[in-house]
Interface confidence: low
Amino acid sequence: KIVLDPSGSMNIYLVLDGSDSIGASNFTGAKKCLVNLIEKVASYGVKPRYGLVTYATYPKIWVKVSEADSSNADWVTKQLNEINYEDHKLKSGTNTKKALQAVYSMMSWPDDVPPEGWNRTRHVIILMTDGLHNMGGDPITVIDEIRDLLYIGKDRKNPREDYLDVYVFGVGPLVNQVNINALASKKDNEQHVFKVKDMENLEDVFYQMIDESQSLSLCGMVWEHRKGTDYHKQPWQAKISVIRPSKGHESCMGAVVSEYFVLTAAHCFTVDDKEHSIKVSVGGEKRDLEIEVVLFHPNYNINGKKEAGIPEFYDYDVALIKLKNKLKYGQTIRPICLPCTEGTTRALRLPPTTTCQQQKEELLPAQDIKALFVSEEEKKLTRKEVYIKNGDKKGSCERDAQYAPGYDKVKDISEVVTPRFLCTGGVSPYADPNTCRGDSGGPLIVHKRSRFIQVGVISWGVVDVCKNQKRQKQVPAHARDFHINLFQVLPWLKEKLQDEDLGFL
């Protein structure tokens, strides 16, 4: 499999058949597939060097792994997008051997002197062809040369099989399955051959191809494949319930932010709640996690403005649940990205020198920002798309807080909507879905570059649009939701999560 280890070294060779028998639309489809693969790999923060070859009668090398920009995913994608099916029109045979020899030439070393660390680089070849080779020798011989070059399968004690993977995608109207099977790697419990039909669900294909065991701790990663559960799609989501004897129970959401912490809303708890009465579950697991302590933001005080006639005051409505035992990350349990961390810098593929302010400009520009939250409806987690009003609609969004029960007497809305809040909801630019009571504490998320970054914690809403947890279809335009802006509580997060290896900026 493609071992996505951010600390490892990898070369990926993309080889695309542009011969007559493929056809223009299949060629374009294959290109799209490779673009998606580059994006998927890049989303892991892995920076492999790419080689890019198209071929028919002759190969054409578009990107060499030795080029400085070969590890720049955006640049490689640009080169790939600029390739035309017509480029091989005049010599349109299928010489797969020559194409693989072009790959071999990129792998080999000048004067056959291997450079320092050569044996630590993993090599992945992704060949897209119909297998209808009609020129040159059998490409399998080149596969053997490559195996020899990389010292694979020679030493019984250390066969190094995981340093080479050859994937073959059968593209085109007629695919010679035997030919393509011959070229693909054969490894137990792994799939290295994919068909055209598979390419309709690329996420399923990538799920078969990628070994992410070295990068399970990466924040904001998801799997969208068809067999995936709700928690493959939002693996950070935590369900919280507080059992209060004789008072029923309170349901909230939260987000896994590290192996020991779940971030949620402070108002989900009261000072009387004992740790044993708080149930937290993650990854869709039945068992509840043991809680060590709930850490409230020190400035949170729901009764802070009672004397001023404000019954409930949600400023700094954030809390961290510290777990007794370390979470075991997997595909259904992994953290969401937090602002102003090194993980988010990498997730957004920004330079390592990126500042917290630059992350803020990237994630929360002064405009309507497309975001999402996760809600549970009929026992299923669903993503709800909303817009954070952070530009010219911000003021009117915040002013609608006056329609919230108990806030009608508030003279100055900034008394309740402090700078700590982000505002969503309403009907412009689109009719936003609203949060329900049980969504409190869940993350408000920005989805960028295939990664999910939490920018807010769901706190309170103007209108209860969810009778019996069913969202009403018709809601008033003033139905707004308010979320604690994580950029505004960073010192506290930084302090409490300082041992969690998040690399706060």
Epitope: P298, N299, L490, P491, W492, E495, Q498, D499, D501
Partner: antibody, heavy 115, light 107 residues
Framework: EVQLVESGGALVKPGGSLKLSCAAS????????MSWVRQTPEKRLEWVAT????????YYPDSVKGRFTISRDNAKNTLYLQMSSLRSEDTALYYC????????WGQGTSVTVSS | DIVMTQSHKFMSTSVGDRVSITCKAS??????VAWYQQKPGQSPKLLIY???TRHTGVPDRFTGSGSGTDFTLTITNVQSEDLAVYFC?????????FGAGTKLELK
């Protein structure tokens, strides 16, 4: 009740070394970041070092970086400060303190660097 | 480094008075400021953290306020046991820094 008791302070010559200890009790030591702060003869407070609760991270100001090493033994509930290449400006009362910001301080141990 | 400036080295007060001790940070530290009280021969004691939160057991005559760069510790109804040196401290970023202290004395 939270208690922090420093020890190991002494009179030492410039260029010399010294190891301070701080015995903690009354709280779960391994749950907290710990720091050393010193108070100069002029009564100024200076942060010296911080170590995270599991000891993975250590932080120092430039004035002591490379000369001082903070460490901890969570099994013994003890915090340490190894000081080397001592200078006269290191003369101070050294406190160990819990958390960040420091919520509990010990009584201090006196270090005098003089020839 | 962030410099914490306490402009008054000394402040005179009388029992029952209200006094405000100020502290200015050289750059924005949000609300990551703490106030300590130190009496002669004793170690510093935490009074206020996160600019305005009273530490456990601290009498409510002590209040903290401010954010960004300007911070104030206010003592209403000063008691004789409040005569001490007060230090402000920023824990927003390393290196952690303290103010030089303000000594509260009787007029």
């Amino acid at each position: 009740e939270v208690q922090l008791v420093e020890s190991g302070g002494a009179l030492v010559k410039p260029g010399g070394s010294l190891k301070l200890s701080c015995a903690a009790s009354g709280f779960t030591f391994s749950n907290y970041a710990m720091s050393w702060v010193r108070q100069t003869p002029e009564k100024r407070l200076e942060w010296v070092a911080t170590i995270s609760n599991r000891g993975s991270y250590t932080y120092y100001p430039d004035s002591v970086k490379g000369r001082f090493t903070i460490s901890r033994d969570n099994a013994k509930n003890t915090l340490y400060l190894q000081m080397s290449s001592l200078r006269s400006e290191d003369t101070a009362l050294y406190y160990c303190a819990r958390e960040r910001p420091m919520d509990y301080w010990g009584q201090g141990t006196s270090v005098t660097v003089s020839s | 480094d962030i410099v914490m400036t306490q402009s008054h080295k000394f402040m005179s007060t009388s029992v029952g008075d209200r006094v405000s001790i100020t502290c200015k940070a050289s750059q924005d530290v949000g609300t990551a400021v703490a106030w300590y009280q130190q009496k002669p021969g004793q170690s510093p004691k935490l009074l206020i953290y996160w600019a305005s939160t009273r530490h456990t057991g601290v009498p409510d005559r002590f209040t903290g306020s401010g954010s960004g760069t300007d911070f104030t510790l206010t003592i209403t109804n000063v008691q004789s046991e409040d005569l001490a040196v007060y230090f402000c401290h920023q824990h927003s970023s390393n290196p952690l820094t303290f103010g030089a202290g303000t000594k509260l004395e009787l007029k």
